[in-house]
């Protein structure tokens, strides 16, 4: 069911890889180390996943339970407006953004925050489990 689109929702999610957490119909990876935004994206892509794209407030609230004050990179960037890596606009939540040079999105337990993209942060990857092929 996940085949055919890079950004579909997993329907059946039997299992996640080691060190990935199964939540709902997806697998999530919370990094221990820190990287800049681009390196975090590359890490996720190399593991058939993507930097976290949050689909709605419910998913965001659930994920924030696992987060601390420390920020984690997610698949959100400001290219003439805040957009997720799947191309969809950020429309269900506010991002705290202060400066023109802060064009990458991060999340912690308190919400979304813009940051300069080269800041080393933890990151979150998201993917469908083994039985499915899509990234989301």
């Amino acid at each position: 069911l996940c085949q055919g689109s890079n950004y579909s929702t997993c329907a059946s999610c039997p299992s996640c890889p080691d060190r990935w957490m199964k939540y709902g119909n997806h697998c999530y990876y919370f990094s221990v180390e820190e990287k800049d935004w681009n390196s975090s994206l590359e890490f996720c892509l190399a593991r058939d996943s993507h930097l976290l794209v949050i689909t709605d407030n419910q998913e965001m609230s659930l994920l924030q339970v696992f987060l601390s004050e420390a920020f984690c990179w997610i698949g959100l960037r400001n290219n003439s407006g805040w957009r997720w890596e799947d191309g969809s606009p950020l429309n269900f939540s506010r991002i705290s953004s202060n400066s023109f040079v802060q064009t990458c999105g991060a999340i912690n337990k308190n919400g979304l925050q813009a940051s300069s993209c080269e800041v080393p942060l933890h990151w979150v990857c998201k993917k469908c489990p083994f039985a499915d092929q899509a990234l989301f």
Partner: antibody
């Protein structure tokens, strides 16, 4: 809209301590990635970086002046403070505060995207 | 400390003409993370500096496209394609790649 405004004593005597305040609005001093730095400019001369303080209270100083400088902040009042001990006439300058944006290093690489208008300080006996 | 040398110190220009300011660093200011933290600021008479360019060539928000930054390693240039009266003032380059961060001595852009 982001604004910064410096205030100081205007004139003070050699060996006294200079106390400067930077009052900010339009952003929070405790927001991740935000900092405030102090820069000075003697009349008709260039710019000299002095110190900066980050959102989490991490502080950095110009090495040559470090023993005389103290930077601090009160996030609840949106103010950043700089003290310069034992001033002399060489400290006569316009003092600017500027917002600095974090790029991943505490000590260096940042952008100063908003500046205050500056406050003039004269050290004279 | 990284010495930032700006040339010329004074640049007389005619309105509508192109202006070019050079900034050379005493050592490479390419950071170990691959980025080059070279910025340009303009200080108009009686005002505080304003950021124009960050990371060598990125124009800051609201900066007109007649301003462009270029360069790499130790050699950097700010170009103004068609000088307007509001562009007059002192231009400073700034490196943030190495501690302590340092400014150039400034280039005064004035009318010929």
């Amino acid at each position: 809209q982001v604004t910064l405004k410096e205030s100081g004593p205007g004139i003070l005597q050699p060996s006294q301590t200079l106390s400067l305040t930077c009052s900010v609005s339009g952003f929070s001093l405790s927001t991740f990635g935000m900092g405030v730095g102090w820069i000075r400019q003697p009349s008709g001369k260039g710019l000299e970086w002095l110190a900066h303080i980050w959102w989490d209270d991490d502080k950095w100083y110009e090495l040559a002046l470090k023993s005389r400088l103290t930077i601090s902040k009160d996030s609840s009042k949106n103010q950043v403070f700089l003290k310069i001990a034992n001033v002399d006439t060489a400290d006569t300058a316009t003092y600017f505060c500027a917002r600095v944006i974090y790029y991943g290093s505490r000590s260096a690489y940042y952008s100063m995207d908003y500046w205050g208008p500056g406050t003039s300080v004269t050290v004279s006996s | 400390d990284v010495l930032m040398t700006q040339t010329p110190l004074s640049l007389p220009v005619s309105l509508g003409a192109q202006a070019s300011i050079s900034c050379k660093s005493s050592q490479s200011i390419v950071h170990s993370n691959g980025h080059t933290y070279l910025e340009w600021y303009l200080q108009k008479p009686g005002q505080s500096p304003k950021i124009l360019i960050y990371k060598v060539s990125n124009r800051f928000s609201g900066v007109p496209d007649r301003f462009s930054g270029s360069g790499s390693g130790t050699d950097f240039t700010l170009k103004i394609s068609r000088v307007e009266a509001e562009d007059l003032g002192v231009y400073y380059c700034f490196q943030g790649s190495h501690v302590p961060v340092t400014f150039g001595a400034g280039t005064k852009l004035e009318l010929k």
